[in-house]
Each structure stands twice: as structure tokens, then as C-alpha cells.
């Protein structure tokens, strides 16, 4: 099974002397998830032509994937560390239902999909410890998530493939933006 960052003593300098919320730990964790996403994207692109498809907009209309916007304060222009940290945590919480959807979408990378899901949960915990302004963080309603999951799983094969591709692409972009922003916190 994939090793989570910090489980392997070679992976992190002085593993026991670092708080879980340290910049390096969080950075490593995000990079670990990004590596997992790359592996999943590889399988998705190999088994379908979704990665070259120009029909993404059709499927995107059905999805409400978290996305960084100027108002979230996570870009260089208008950077706001408190607002941004809340957005990162909220966005990750919103991605959880989509990561759950991905669990049955992979054959050879089934373990990798599980690792991405589990390490995202751990990342959320790390970031919640780091966040001071926890009141502003809204958790998605379980019932809303359940109905969204049912709706996604009921799509035809082409839409399911496209949805998988879009989730992975959006999650990658969200994490890359988070990585850049967290560097200045």
C-alpha cells in the first residue's frame, strides 16, 4: 500500500520533532496527494480519450467542483491568509464527496484512489489544527452529499468517465493553488 508522508522515517527530517501542522509536513502531504492524482489521471487517460476531449463543458455543467476565485484570497493579488485558509479547508471538505465517487472508478489504481481519499482526510485535519478561524468553515450536509453521489453514479458511462477526468483535473488545480498559498502562511 502507498506509504503516507511521515510514516517512513526516510521521508521526513527528524519526523518526531515536527508538529503535524508544520509547513513542511503539510507541503509533503499535498505533494503526496498530487502524486496519487497523477497516477489516477494516467489510468483515466489511458483507458479513454477524455483527456483530449473538447466536450468537457457538457459534463462540467452537472458538477459544482470547488474552485479558487479572486475573492477567496488565495492568489498573489489580494492575498488574505485567513480567508484563504478557510477556503482551502472548505474546498477540501467539498471535494470529499467527489473523492468518494472515485473509489469505484479504477481497476489497476484502486489502492491509489483509496490513498488519495484517506490522505485528503488527514490533510483536512492538519489544516483545521492550523486554522484559527474555524467558525467560518462550513461542512457539506451529509444528505446533500449522498444525493449528489447517487446522481453521479446514475450517469451514463461516457459522463462517468468525463466526471472522473474533471474531478481529478479540478482537484489537482485546487491543490496546486493551495500549495502556493500555504507557502506564504
Amino acid at each position: 500500500a502507498p506509504v503516507l508522508p511521515g510514516e517512513d522515517s526516510k521521508d521526513v527530517a527528524a519526523p518526531h520533532s515536527q508538529p503535524l501542522t508544520s509547513s513542511e509536513r503539510i507541503d509533503k502531504h499535498i505533494r503526496y496527494i498530487l502524486d496519487g492524482i497523477s497516477a489516477l489521471r494516467k489510468e483515466t487517460c489511458n483507458r479513454s480519450n477524455m483527456c483530449e476531449s473538447s466536450k468537457e463543458a457538457l459534463a462540467e455543467n452537472n458538477l459544482n467542483l470547488p474552485k479558487m476565485a479572486e475573492k477567496d484570497g488565495c492568489f498573489q493579488s489580494g492575498f488574505n491568509e485567513d480567508t484563504c485558509l478557510v477556503k482551502i479547508i472548505t474546498g477540501l471538505l467539498e471535494f470529499e464527496v467527489y473523492l468518494e465517487y472515485l473509489q469505484n472508478r479504477f481497476e489497476s489504481s484502486e489502492e491509489q484512489a483509496r490513498a488519495v481519499q484517506m490522505s485528503t482526510k488527514v490533510l483536512i485535519q492538519f489544516l483545521q489544527k492550523k486554522a484559527k478561524n474555524l467558525d467560518a468553515i462550513t461542512t457539506p450536509e451529509p444528505t446533500t452529499n449522498a444525493s449528489l453521489l447517487t446522481k453521479l453514479q446514475a450517469q451514463n458511462q461516457w459522463l462517468q468517465d468525463m466526471t472522473t477526468h474533471l474531478i481529478l483535473r479540478s482537484f489537482k488545480e485546487f491543490l496546486q493553488s493551495s500549495l502556493r498559498a500555504l507557502r506564504q502562511m
Epitope: 509533503k28 488574505n80 507557502r183
Partner: antibody, heavy 118, light 109 residues
Framework: EVQLLESGGGLVQPGGSLRLSCAAS????????MSWVRQAPGKGPEWVSR????????YYGDSVKGRFTISRDNSKNTLYLQMNSLRAEDTAVYYC?????WGSGDYWGQGTLVTVSS | QTVVTQEPSFSVSPGGTVTLTCGLS?????????PGWYQQTPGQAPRALIY???DRHSGVPDRFSGSISGNKAALTITGAQAEDEADYYC?????????FGGGTQLTVL
Amino acid sequence: EVQLLESGGGLVQPGGSLRLSCAASGFTFSSYAMSWVRQAPGKGPEWVSRISAGGGSTYYGDSVKGRFTISRDNSKNTLYLQMNSLRAEDTAVYYCANRAGWGSGDYWGQGTLVTVSS
Amino acid sequence: QTVVTQEPSFSVSPGGTVTLTCGLSSGSVTASNYPGWYQQTPGQAPRALIYSTNDRHSGVPDRFSGSISGNKAALTITGAQAEDEADYYCALDIGDITEFGGGTQLTVL
């Protein structure tokens, strides 16, 4: 053009205090974490402290923890280092630097000399 | 306390290639340590050469390149010139702090 200009250095007695300032220009100061790095005569650089872009988080090297305080005023584009209980080993050139990120590297000022001696 | 290690000294012939390394006393250097490289000549402030492992600072000649090789960060100078004779320091983010190496004194013979 990025410019960082340190000031406030000078000669101070052991146990004394000093406040360093760093005036920043040429970049979006409030979007960058900022650091103080020092270099004792004939030695290599030593990281002293860092403050997050919004000022909400501060970090310190073991040698200055509890004695030095980093702060910033984003409305004035200025970084500060309050140094208390100064020791002879704090004698160094103090540089301020922005944290690499947003696609650009870190820039350093020319430094201000702090001498702790009786 | 994790120590950042560098070769104390190195020499290279003009036009030659040299690789300086930056390691950790415990563990491997990764991209999450954001390796940075600095050049310092006598009487001058350190000058940033490389940040975030392999990004070249603006105005730095392309003979300077950064990488992670094995478990260390590396600075390679390809086609060394006389003006490259200087002290080179690496810096790593470790946990929430930054640690500098002891430096490598590079001589261009």
C-alpha cells in the same frame, strides 16, 4: 524593481534592546511571508525568524526564541524585528528577505549591522 | 536539531562542471524542503541563485542549475567562470523553520 532597505542597527550593550525596520517596495508586500536572516562576521547566514503574509503566524530560530519578536505593518510595507536581552553572539549583519513564491525568488536587502559590546 | 550539510570546499577548472550538494543529517531532502542556493563574494550580501529546488532567480546565468539527486539537493555549475569563485550556501525549510548549510568555498583554478 524589488527593494528591501534595513535600518535601525548600531552599537548596543549586552542586555540592551534594538528595533530593526525593513522598508519594502517593488512587490506586493502583503502577499509575501517575510524573514530576518543574520550573518555574524566570518560566518555563514543564520535564519532568525519568519512572519506569514498577514502577520498571523510567526516562527523563530532556537537561538532567539523568547528574546526577539518579528512583526509587520502591511499598510506601511514595513517589517520589524524587536530584539531584547541582546548578547555578544547576536552581533551580525541583519538582512530582511521575502519568501520565494508566486513564481519568483527571494530578495534580500543589503543588511544593517548590529554590534553588541560593552 | 537537524543539520544541513555541505562540502566545506571544492575546486573546479575554468570551463569545467561542478556539482555542490546539500543534505540533511537525518532524512532525505525533498521538494517540500524548498532547497535554495545563494552565492556570496567577500563584502557582499548573499545573492539568491536558485529557489524551490530548480527555479533560477531572475538575472542568474543559465550555467547555474538546481536539482534533487538521490537524497540531496544539488547545485550544478556548467562551464565555470572565474567570477563564480565564491562561497555557496544552501537553505532548506525544515518543519516551520529554515536552516542554512555551513557553506562551500568554491575555487576556480
